[in-house]
Interface confidence: low
Amino acid sequence: TQNKALPENVKYGIVLDAGSSHTSLYIYKWPAEKENDTGVVHQVEECRVKGPGISKFVQKVNEIGIYLTDCMERAREVIPRSQHQETPVYLGATAGMRLLRMESEELADRVLDVVERSLSNYPFDFQGARIITGQEEGAYGWITINYLLGKFSQKTRWFSIVPYETNNQETFGALDLGGASTQVTFVPQNQTIESPDNALQFRLYGKDYNVYTHSFLCYGKDQALWQKLAKDIQVASNEILRDPCFHPGYKKVVNVSDLYKTPCTKRFEMTLPFQQFEIQGIGNYQQCHQSILELFNTSYCPYSQCAFNGIFLPPLQGDFGAFSAFYFVMKFLNLTSEKVSQEKVTEMMKKFCAQPWEEIKTSYAGVKEKYLSEYCFSGTYILSLLLQGYHFTADSWEHIHFIGKIQGSDAGWTLGYMLNLTNMIPAEQPLSTPLSHSTYVAHHHHHHHHHH
């Protein structure tokens, strides 16, 4: 008899990452009979939604439906029609929406309401849109990278999946940088997590993990830049701000009203004798670094050790995966190689920031000027945050791995979020038969809601 190809017994899931600067849709796929195994879920598609983050639609909520259309239609094409109805769709909004909610709960709810109504119109199994906490964002990012690196697998391998993978079961820490917040998450070495807000306990695949996590709201790269500008304009003697974080010859006019729009600049707000000011780049890495350091209050620490702003941080431990904007920025600057030391990165940043704006524009003609102009700041900010903020040193820098994808799946919180909400990370080691719902554990922490 002729061999007939059996239909693939696969499942799909969709997660929308509604970030502060943009929204991305991720489609995940996995073999149905292996959904409790570690490392079987993989990303098959990423669709970047054209336009800004959803928080920017606060005055034009009627445009949200159109905004989401292209990527949702793309999901319809990628996922076989027969599976549409059983494919879960989750939308998680992060720090951009956390900031909007701080300004007005009503406005944030209005945006989410329209998002939910738009997503409900598609033939998928829509599971809701919500603003995830910073703690969840950190935790799910940590789960994602360790799941993809095979750290939860009990089978030790004699080969490595990825170049920087150490062939042991020590988990990687997760460093996530967004536009509005940044997260640091790792398992400290025999260290008490002195602040309960920063402690998570997981039981995954039969093993207990005590995890430290913190999300610094307003310390994503875009909000950090707004903070820096608001701080520096306080001491400008007129409406010219000579800024070392922009290339020499770069000029841009900023509205003071835009500067003070975000809650992140409230602490620096003051009545200025002008409505607009002009940034004039002077391109000096060291001065830029010095200015950024002033955003980190290290003058008080109620714990044995702090990152900044009085937030507990245990001693760093093990290897770290740095993803999202940590990766995008360093990739653009060509600084993601494992061989590049921290000293070399600093030297390269000094040279890059000192390059005249006209030269930069010519060298990177294909890059949007808005993004291009901010790489000097962003690169310097990343160094400042990692070295002074999180206390990495020239030596421990070598334990930071700038990661875009692992095994074809983007590093980020979305995969971990879906794994949790679809109950695909069992608390105990999977048996040959799937376990009942009751044996699954999201995490023993009041901030986390397990979805059924």
Epitope: Q286, Q290, L293, T298, S299, Q388
Partner: antibody, heavy 119, light 107 residues
Framework: EVQLVESGGGLVKPGGSLKLPCAAS????????MHWVRQAPEKGLEWVAY????????YYADTVKGRFTISRDNAKNTLFLQMTSLRSEDTAMYYC????????????WGQGTTLTVAS | DIQMTQSPSSLSASLGERVSLTCRAS??????LIWLQQKPDGTIKRLIY???TLDSGVPKRFSGNRSGSDYSLTISSLESEDFADYYC?????????FGGGTKLEIK
Amino acid sequence: EVQLVESGGGLVKPGGSLKLPCAASGFTFSDYGMHWVRQAPEKGLEWVAYISSGSSIIYYADTVKGRFTISRDNAKNTLFLQMTSLRSEDTAMYYCARDLYYDHVLDYWGQGTTLTVAS
Amino acid sequence: DIQMTQSPSSLSASLGERVSLTCRASQEISGYLIWLQQKPDGTIKRLIYAASTLDSGVPKRFSGNRSGSDYSLTISSLESEDFADYYCLQYASYPRTFGGGTKLEIK
């Protein structure tokens, strides 16, 4: 002409309190961060505290943390150092200095005022 | 905290002589260093900022230099008004820290 004038020094008993003012003139005081620095007799300079232009950032040396408070009144162009629980080791000449990144870091200093803590 | 180790603690030199004072930082300070002069009457004056930039009004015989974590102040030809105490200060991080000082005396 930039001028910084400290005053208010004197003799104080251990455990006592004193507030030192520093009057600024000749520049836009509200644009600048300000420092207090001290020098014990026959010793080197020791940084004490810093306050940013808008008072949003404040730092202290460990030796004075919890006892000294730096503050400013931008309307009156005056910097202050409130000192409490004074000890004999706080005996020193106290200087104020202005600070504005990038080229005005501690570029002008006052002439100093003397504090003596003794019973 | 960043320690600044200044040497020598005292130095006797003659008019017209060239002298160098050094400060070593215990951690990277990326050139965030100033040099100060304190006259016998207690007056303090900044000479150099950002490790090597001369303040306006400061004679050209003063110069600042950096070599790794070592920072130096050189006076190319001593004049009588240069005999004073000299301090370095790092402004890379808080707390700000001074070198122990160098007393420059006439030989």
